[in-house]
Interface confidence: medium
């Protein structure tokens, strides 16, 4: 499959984890893949009785999942790690979490802030 | 309870076809990808095959591409892996799955084994 | 595709031993990878997704950890019932590949 319409050459970075794995805490990260595949963008959290908990955003390999879409979107009713993934630059900065099975749409908007480009 | 439960499996010749299926049960089947699994005797875990929750993308392993073709009946709750020219290197018991890509397979079925002889 | 590598390929250990079991991916894949635990004759289990996170029911002797192409699969204190082949797996892209496999044996 060729390149999307959307064509994603860098996306929003995260990483709740960073001390850790010894990487930046946030910031912008350019996106490297094969040739003849798609990439993404994408978004990870967790929702604990409310409360958002970033887990990591940056680029995602090519899947399907993730063709056509402009906003990341979570469709899975009460996952353990929400995910979604988008095409577009920098399409990751906002979330949301909209169930297939119904329910309310919950749009998660990010604090601004002054980011680093990760290589 | 989350229940995948395989059938389809069997003793076929070099060259024959088969199809399996996954009935299952326990969840909301249509807003789950799918996947094959096989593990050849005595051998390790691969990666066959995903179809995602609508059927309409799919990803095969260069080992089964143009040979095995993945679906689903969303109606049914049923996977299907219709496999073709089958070769000895298939013999393996297979296996589906549930689960998003990124958290694993979080849920397996028992297996069905194919023995291509 | 991105290859991953376990070792050792089999391990052997007495009950209440620590084991560590090492994954390395062929390139990056960020905290993308799971650990399973397959029993003979049986399908296998979800241990740790996300590198870390224990899957639910799984005992808290598991644990993951790891990011980039290193990863770490340990148990704390073994148990009889853990003596079983533990693959990893990475999520991050198609086709979404397993390590060979580490047999954790009875010493």
């Known amino acids: 499959s060729g390149r999307g319409e959307a064509e994603t050459r860098e996306c929003i970075y995260y990483n709740a984890n960073w001390e850790l794995e010894r990487t930046n805490q946030s910031g912008l990260e350019r996106c490297e893949g094969e040739q003849d595949k798609r990439l993404h963008c994408y978004a990870s959290w967790r929702n604990s009785s409310g409360t958002i908990e970033l887990v990591k955003k940056g680029c995602w390999l090519d899947d399907f999942n993730c063709y056509d879409r402009q906003e990341c979107v979570a469709t899975e009713e009460n996952p353990q790690v929400y995910f979604c993934c988008c095409e577009g630059n920098f399409c990751n900065e906002r979330f949301t979490h909209l169930p297939e099975a119904g329910g309310p749409e919950v749009t998660y908007e990010p604090p601004p802030t002054a980011p680093t480009l990760l290589t | 309870e989350v229940q995948l439960l395989e059938s389809g499996g069997g003793l076929v010749q070099p060259g024959g076809s088969l199809r399996l299926s996954c009935a299952a049960s326990?969840?909301?089947?249509?807003?789950?990808?799918m996947t094959w699994v096989r593990q050849a005797p005595g051998k390790g875990l691969e990666w066959v095959s995903v179809i995602s929750g609508s059927g309409g993308g799919t990803y095969y392993a260069d080992s089964v591409k143009g040979r095995f073709t993945i679906s689903r009946d969303n109606s049914k709750n049923t996977l299907y892996l219709q496999m073709n020219s089958l070769r000895a290197e298939d013999t393996a018991v297979y296996y589906c799955?549930?689960?998003?890509?990124?958290?694993?397979?979080?849920?397996w079925g028992q297996g069905t084994t194919v023995t291509v002889s | 595709d991105i290859q991953m590598t376990q070792s050792p390929s089999s391990v052997s250990a007495s009950v209440g031993d620590r084991v560590t079991i090492t994954c390395r991916a062929s390139?990056?894949?960020?905290?993308?990878l799971a650990w399973y635990q397959q029993k003979p004759g049986k399908a296998p289990k979800l241990l740790i997704y996300?590198?870390?996170s224990l899957q639910s029911g799984v005992p808290s002797r598991f644990s993951g950890s790891g990011s980039g192409t290193d990863f770490t699969l340990t148990i704390s204190s073994l148990q009889p019932e853990d003596f079983a082949t533990y693959y990893c797996q990475q999520v991050f892209s198609y086709p979404l590949t397993f390590g060979g496999g580490t047999k954790v044996e009875i010493k």
């Open positions: 996300a590198a870390s």
């Open positions: 799955a549930k689960g998003p890509r990124i958290v694993g397979m979080d849920v």
């Open positions: 326990g969840f909301t089947f249509g807003s789950y990808g």
């Open positions: 390139q990056g894949i960020s905290s993308w």
